[in-house]
């Protein structure tokens, strides 16, 4: 999103109009406490969508904060929006009006809070005061937001100066309740485990003496009840812990644990749940496909992923051509098996400036004592191709023959083409296309050899011209997957005695 | 959704070898993991081997590792298990079995396909 002016703050005279612009490659909108005021929104012929917002007889009441974001957030990336303050100086509108719920501000514990006086011009000195008091509490500013900081029970007023008149704000009143609220929370040793191990679960409260726990899970159902034990950390003040263990699982302990926790003092409770996998035998599952075959380009770094789940946690190693690979200590290559969640992993294997010589049969294979994976593919280097040679002769037989030799990864594909017009070629004319069966004057013989030690191939084509009667550009373009090489050469008939 | 046929089965001498194969109807076999499982009477199923939706992934289990061989033919929508150097222990109920939730696994609960089952019997 691109707004002009840019801000991310602007300072307009009252009574002025002011033009706002946003622009972005979807359907854009201005937004003004919530609300699309009147815009004019356009689309581009280069595909670009903007939105217009004409401020007209600014007053201080126009201050604030205008944003603009995406019309329709669906399928982006991303859910962008650009903030914009302006202030409208205004000496008749002394301090923003709050909505009646905006003076009246609850805590439930002590935390930063913000008492959102405003006013409308930037330069003013603005004070926070006890309602019943004239001293100036040391809190810090914003002119854009208010006073931030932590408060007392108490009523606050906003007092300002403007030209020779005091200002005060509506009062504003902080409430700290009172809530011993119940937090719970939930956690286990492991949430998958194999059949005969144990399972092992937590319950935590914060903040309370007198709790009581419930658990549920899948044996209560069947009426196979476990004894949960609680305890008090005794490191951490109103910490209470019931935990609960099943030794020796069973495939039907699978599902859900709830922890529910009361506190009968004023009947607060809250619950959390987990879920346990309990599965017959360790295993491995690949969450995505690595194609058989993958490229990487002859210089460059390329990185192959490969993401997985398994239990117990496995040991990764990666072979190329049944051999196995560590890190190089040249740098040449770097491999590593992160954990990225309890049983998920992602292995990587970084080839740094790729030779020829690693292309091959690479292999990552991840085991433990119960299951395995082996996962295969073939990495090819790709060559960008380059035109080695470009030569023209004249045998006996009267016609002239132009060859051409290159190299490349994947097979390079040849294009001949010839420019007769030398001045006005190839700037003003398209140069032919030649060796087309249809073209009686030209023959075309391309022979492809496949290089085992370079794994490349190399392609040569011979051009027969049949009768050149004036100066001609022969041109020889190669072209794979990865790049393209040209080399021209000018052709002269037999009779001319020179060469250009 | 997919079928799942298996064949091969069979008597077989101790030392010998044998091919199980597993026919899938459906048109979209190429989006499905397989794998070869086993049963005898009064366990568990147990895994055998499996293999990745193009091929590119294998696995075996420890019992069967180095004597096996899975591989599929995406073009016949088949899958194969080629035993060899059967040992009695390799007597059991083979199940061939297919997940669309994983390009790989060797979980039994991650299948979601499974087969009639064929009946492999190593004998002295």
């Known amino acids: 999103l691109v707004v002009t002016p840019p801000g991310p703050e602007l300072v307009l005279n009252v009574s002025s109009t002011f033009v706002l612009t946003c622009s972005g490659s979807a359907p854009v909108v201005w937004e003004r406490m919530s609300q699309e005021p009147p815009q004019e929104m356009a689309k581009a012929q280069d595909g670009t969508f903007s939105s217009v917002l004409t401020l007209t007889n600014l007053t201080g009441l126009d201050t604030g904060e205008y944003f603009c974001t995406h019309n329709d957030s669906r399928g982006l990336e991303t859910d962008e929006r650009k903030r914009l303050y302006i202030f409208v100086p205004d000496p008749t509108v002394g301090f923003l009006p709050n909505d009646a719920e905006e003076l009246f501000i609850f805590l439930t514990e002590i935390t930063e809070i913000t008492i959102p006086c405003r006013v409308t011009d930037p330069q003013l000195v603005v004070t926070l005061h006890e309602k019943k008091g004239d001293v100036a509490l040391p809190v810090p500013y914003d002119h854009q937001r208010g006073f931030s900081g932590i408060f007392e029970d108490r009523s606050y007023i906003c007092k300002t100066t403007i030209g020779d008149r005091e200002v005060d704000s509506d009062a504003y009143y902080v409430y700290r309740l009172q809530v011993s609220s119940i937090n719970v929370s939930v956690n286990a040793v492991q949430t998958v485990v194999r059949q005969g191990e144990n399972i092992t679960l937590m319950c935590i409260v914060i903040g309370n003496e007198v709790v009581n726990f419930e658990w549920t899970y899948p044996r209560k159902e069947s009426g196979r009840l476990v004894e949960p034990v609680t305890d008090f950390l005794l490191d951490m003040p109103y910490h209470i812990r019931s935990i609960l263990h099943i030794p020796s699982a069973e495939l039907e302990d699978s599902g859900t644990y709830t922890c529910n926790v009361t506190e009968s003092v004023n009947d607060h409770q809250d619950e959390k749940a987990i879920n346990i996998t309990v599965v017959e035998s360790g295993y491995v599952r690949l969450l995505g496909e690595v194609g058989t075959l993958q490229f990487a380009e002859l210089h460059r770094s390329r990185t192959l992923q490969v993401v997985f789940e398994a239990y117990p946690p496995p040991t990764v190693l990666w072979f190329k051509d049944n051999r196995t690979l560590g890190d190089s200590s040249a740098g040449e290559i770097a491999l590593s098996t992160r954990n990225v969640s309890e049983t998920r992993y992602v292995s990587e294997l970084t080839l740094v400036r790729v030779k020829v010589a690693e292309a091959g049969h690479y292999t990552m294979r991840a085991f433990h004592e119960d299951a395995e994976v082996q996962l295969s593919f073939q990495l090819q280097i790709n060559v960008p191709v380059r035109v080695l040679e470009l030569s023209e002769s004249h045998p006996d037989s009267g016609e002239q023959t132009v060859r051409c030799r290159g190299r490349g990864m994947p097979q390079p594909n040849i294009i001949w083409s010839a420019c007769r017009d030398l001045k006005r070629c190839p700037r003003e004319l398209p140069p032919t296309l030649l060796g087309n069966s249809s073209e009686e004057e030209s023959q075309l013989e391309t022979n492809v050899t496949y290089w085992e030690e370079e794994q490349e191939f190399e392609v040569v084509s011979t051009l027969r011209l049949q009768h050149v009667d004036r100066p001609l550009s022969v041109r020889c373009t190669l072209r794979n997957a990865v790049g393209q090489d040209t080399q021209e050469v000018i052709v002269v008939p037999h009779s001319l005695p020179f060469k250009v | 959704e997919v079928q799942l046929v298996e064949s091969g089965g069979g008597l077989v001498q101790i030392g010998g070898s044998l091919r199980l194969s597993c026919a899938a109807s459906?048109?979209?076999?190429?989006?499905?993991?397989m794998g070869w499982f086993r049963q005898t009477p009064g366990k568990e199923r147990e895994f055998v081997a499996a293999?990745?939706?193009?091929?590119?992934?294998?696995g075996y289990a420890d019992s069967v590792k180095g004597r096996s061989t899975i591989s599929r033919d995406n073009a016949k929508n088949m899958v194969y298990l080629q035993m060899n150097s059967l040992k009695p222990e390799d007597t059991a109920v083979y199940y061939c079995?297919?997940?669309?939730?994983?390009?790989?696994?060797?979980?039994?609960?991650?299948?979601?396909?499974w087969g009639q089952g064929t009946q492999v019997t190593v004998s002295s």
């Open positions: 293999i990745g939706r193009n091929g590119g992934s294998i």
């Open positions: 459906g048109r979209t076999f190429s989006s499905y993991a």
């Open positions: 079995a297919a997940t669309n939730k994983f390009s790989y696994s060797t979980l039994r609960n991650d299948y979601n396909y």
